[in-house]
Amino acid sequence: KFSKQSWGLENEALIVRCPRQGKPSYTVDWYYSQTNKSIPTQERNRVFASGQLLKFLPAAVADSGIYTCIVRSPTFNRTGYANVTIYKKQSDCNVPDYLMYSTVSGSEKNSKIYCPTIDLYNWTAPLEWFKNCQALQGSRYRAHKSFLVIDNVMTEDAGDYTCKFIHNENGANYSVTATRSFTVKDEQGFSLFPVIGAPAQNEIKEVEIGKNANLTCSACFGKGTQFLAAVLWQLNGTKITDFGEPRIQQEEGQNQSFSNGLACLDMVLRIADVKEEDLLLQYDCLALNLHGLRRHTVRLSRKNPIDHHS
């Protein structure tokens, strides 16, 4: 329970906190568990203890091992263990799993990625951020204090993010990097009873006999991905495919669009070579999903040709 895993890269600073907590006034002694050898407190040493903190400035692969910390108070002693592993720097970009800190999730509303362990270090801005080893560039990325903010998060923003900063100890600078995965949560969308945006209910559309005409049925269903939502046209209450008039065809497939953040679908009805009998038909725009069905009816009327005579 009072053991903590810590890891770092060779030639980088690593600071480890004792897993046992105590008041600042309590003394903390550190030992290298294998040899029971006391860790010095003098800052001239590469590895030294500083109260609750054990500092590797910089770390070496040979420093790997278990370190014991004993928090001493006038009335009790508390013992903790720090399991430290120092890894060789990878030559390639890939960050292995064992160097990864906990995964964080973000969404369009909350996209902060905190730099892991940074609070243990004496660092000054700016913090550098990399995604999959590439330096982050562009106005969507903002390094703010100890975290990165991503504006307008998209699923493509998921990946491994590395923060890099400089730890300062008595005027000497040491580099530190830490990597964690970022996943993008799809903000839970919602679905609504369909809302037909066009055509208006009982709309009269003017058409010219002999010309082509298009009618668009457009409806919105909610936010995010919509399930089993559809828009379609019917003629006199019959599916277009069953009506049997080859001049009147529905576009193949439904076009998806977004209006004010809502998910919408539209379907175009194409009437070729409009005939008199088409004016007698009832055109129904249907929008439906699991909440139910909404229907708007359109009728066609003849557009009078423009009289060019004086």
Epitope: G189, F227, Q234, K239, L286, L288, L290, L293
Partner: antibody, heavy 118, light 107 residues
Framework: EVQLLESGGGLVQPGGSLRLSCAAS????????MNWVRQAPGKGLEWVST????????FYADSVKGRFTISRDNSKNTLYLQMNSLRAEDTAVYYC???????????WGQGTTVTVSS | DIQMTQSPSSLSASVGDRVTITCRAS??????MAWYQQKPGKAPKLLIY???TLQSGVPSRFSGSGSGTDFTLTISSLQPEDFATYYC?????????FGPGTKVDIK
Amino acid sequence: EVQLLESGGGLVQPGGSLRLSCAASGFTFSDYYMNWVRQAPGKGLEWVSTISGFGESTFYADSVKGRFTISRDNSKNTLYLQMNSLRAEDTAVYYCARLGAARAFDIWGQGTTVTVSS
Amino acid sequence: DIQMTQSPSSLSASVGDRVTITCRASQSIGSWMAWYQQKPGKAPKLLIYAASTLQSGVPSRFSGSGSGTDFTLTISSLQPEDFATYYCQQSYTTPITFGPGTKVDIK
């Protein structure tokens, strides 16, 4: 008792046609989206098609689009699947299923077997 | 299309064991996850819908959890009648897709 009962399966040659039926009872049929789901021998489940409550809208898996047609007759409480241009890979047990609470298939039929072979 | 992966593909367990089956979606599906049990020669039976809601009539030893991409079906104490194949299914978007199944058999 809520029940679905499929029929119409059988042996058919590649390129042939078959019409499956599913008789529903014990619930208001038109209130529900209905579905066909199939399972090839020794394989997992595969969604085939969905139809809305009054048949206005239909949805298909890409593997059957243009070959299969889902329909329903609410006066008879019956769901249909017209299967044309059948292929060997359409061989499966075909289940009809009701889409219920939270978009899950809550009621299933016992299945009908379709074998496409020469 | 959203791919569903299940693990393990099969497992052997004893009566009384706690069994956990996981399902992962290739993209976030919110809580639109269902779990089914299928016995040889029978139709699937709905166990869990909306990721964690127990279907009426299903024993309380079955439970579901998870959201987004990672989901779990747990059988707290395996009973003889629970030896079957279990499928997960997403209904976040069409095409509706199922996991490949996890076969639970007797050790």
